[in-house]
Amino acid sequence: EAHKSEIAHRYNDLGEQHFKGLVLIAFSQYLQKCSYDEHAKLVQEVTDFAKTCVADESAANCDKSLHTLFGDKLCAIPNLRENYGELADCCTKQEPERNECFLQHKDDNPSLPPFERPEAEAMCTSFKENPTTFMGHYLHEVARRHPYFYAPELLYYAEQYNEILTQCCAEADKESCLTPKLDGVKEKALVSSVRQRMKCSSMQKFGERAFKAWAVARLSQTFPNADFAEITKLATDLTKVNKECCHGDLLECADDRAELAKYMCENQATISSKLQTCCDKPLLKKAHCLSEVEHDTMPADLPAIAADFVEDQEVCKNYAEAKDVFLGTFLYEYSRRHPDYSVSLLLRLAKKYEATLEKCCAEANPPACYGTVLAEFQPLVEEPKNLVKTNCDLYEKLGEYGFQNAILVRYTQKAPQVSTPTLVEAARNLGRVGTKCCTLPEDQRLPCVEDYLSAILNRVCLLHEKTPVSEHVTKCCSGSLVERRPCFSALTVDETYVPKEFKAETFTFHSDICTLPEKEKQIKKQTALAELVKHKPKATAEQLKTVMDDFAQFLDTCCKAADKDTCFSTEGPNLVTRCKDALA
């Protein structure tokens, strides 16, 4: 229903705390360079205004749209052009063009320093002094670095953060309590970020239709006892929620997500037997829990998929009468039978089925033509299964760091023109798939591996889009989202690449590397590895292993030496010479 004042309506629905958090996230995601204090001031002004509208919905400007209100606030920021360049041009436009202009200027890779965690004592002191400001800083710092982070989920992570600090700051050894717990939240939040960015990419490039197909497959796997009408309703609602968040309508998104969670909990009987535990939780935890709830037990009496989609004499008639609905039921039926497949694979199978019907239903004898369609799925299923087996075997053999290095070599050979920092970031993220997925039971590995890889490769595509340098990457990123991962996997050494000349300074290290945290040391070594491959794209695995072992030995020796500086300055050039010889 229409409300006299949209801002009053959302304030009432969400409550002050969530309202303020979401407005802060929205501003931080739009204007990523502004300080926390600048945004906090705007948030307070918007909140005070919302309260006046709650008191009197007819008050001046209360009938304005949220985009108009928020956009006017952002455009009133002083020195907008100096700080944001052409983003300031958005302010010359009217709504809704202005908001969509802001959206198009969101930066997936803002030049902001990494979000450093203060040491435990300092963190606990500032948390105790002002928990609200502390959490505000967290929302601001995450949101500006991840401009598409799923806003209601970010509120959930802030709540987790809050609970961890409340618990650990009361302990004697704050550090050992905080570190593992906060590391866990950070890891989950980073995965959440790339997954949501993939959803927004799908919406932006391929539309709601593509996202809804993704949602139907995913929901059908999780809720195999729900009927098609129920799955369609959930998919439609979930599409609306994600569309709103991806479009910057964060208050509507959070409100509608809460409504969806409420609906699911009120209709457990027709959805799934596994929801009760989630439904007993408070709002943010409930919605988060529902989003990753375990799959319901599959009905025991499901007929073979062939009955309705291959053997039925009316296949072409049913398809012609309502293509979207017929393909939707196919995707639903296939997905509910295959919780062990990735959503990407299920969508590829549905695409193959559609292409087969398009071709066969135009022929003289359609059933003879589409009769073998399920057998034709086999190679499409085998390819990701082999990928999982090969990569998990390699991960088990090498461990996470070694596995990341193997991926780094592979991807540098596929796309040597891509910047080294991007290749290292991608390889490190891709390599984490081992730790994340390879330890899972067999039937959960494929969906975990492929859907995670797809999300990481989406980020590679977004970064490459800004400065396209590799035809290989452009080719894979231009196709449909579900074909990206197979496209990247199929890439081989880029034969068009002219190797980089050997620069000694690229491989020259100093004693400061010794005091770096382990993660930073790894990044330094991986940067050197990518540069080696760019210098010798056809180096064998054995050659690269020799060089990297030598390099590790050099670091170990010099970092243990009494006079580190001398060791680095004398042994460094020897290492460079040995590298050149080993790769000659």
Epitope: C200, Q204, G207
Partner: nanobody, 124 residues
């Protein structure tokens, strides 16, 4: 291949009304999002109004309350009712269809199909 054909343009006095129509050649139209854009001489193409396949609407601020977008799925047609026309509404009006239902509605690259345009001239 979807074809879009606009009609209803013409010359009208300031304050007057016109109703533009856009007929689509395919049934798939009912699942597409539709929009009207306009282009005045020497200016960029500008978004005017959008209607989601389920019926929700979005308007450019300066036409809100004056223009109404609607659709008749049985006739595969989308309409733009323009009241209280102003001199600055003079432009070629284009109908556009987005079969994928993309997220950015004011951006012309979100649309797969375009009509050839119909001229609207508002005189004083």
């Amino acid at each position: 291949q979807v074809q879009l054909v606009e009609s209803g343009g013409g010359l009208v006095q300031a304050g007057g009304s016109l109703r533009l129509s856009c007929a689509a050649s395919e049934r798939a139209f009912s699942h597409s999002n539709m929009a009207w854009f306009r282009q005045a001489p020497g200016k960029e193409r500008e978004f005017v109004a959008h209607i989601h396949w389920r019926g929700s609407t979005t308007y450019l601020d300066s036409v809100k309350g004056r223009f109404t977008i609607s659709r008749d799925n049985a006739k595969n047609t989308v309409y733009l009712q323009m009241n209280g026309l102003r001199l600055e509404d003079t432009a070629v009006y284009y109908c556009a269809a987005d079969s994928a239902r993309r997220i950015l509605v004011t951006v012309s690259t979100s649309y797969d199909y375009w009509g050839q345009g119909t001229q609207v001239t508002v005189s004083s």
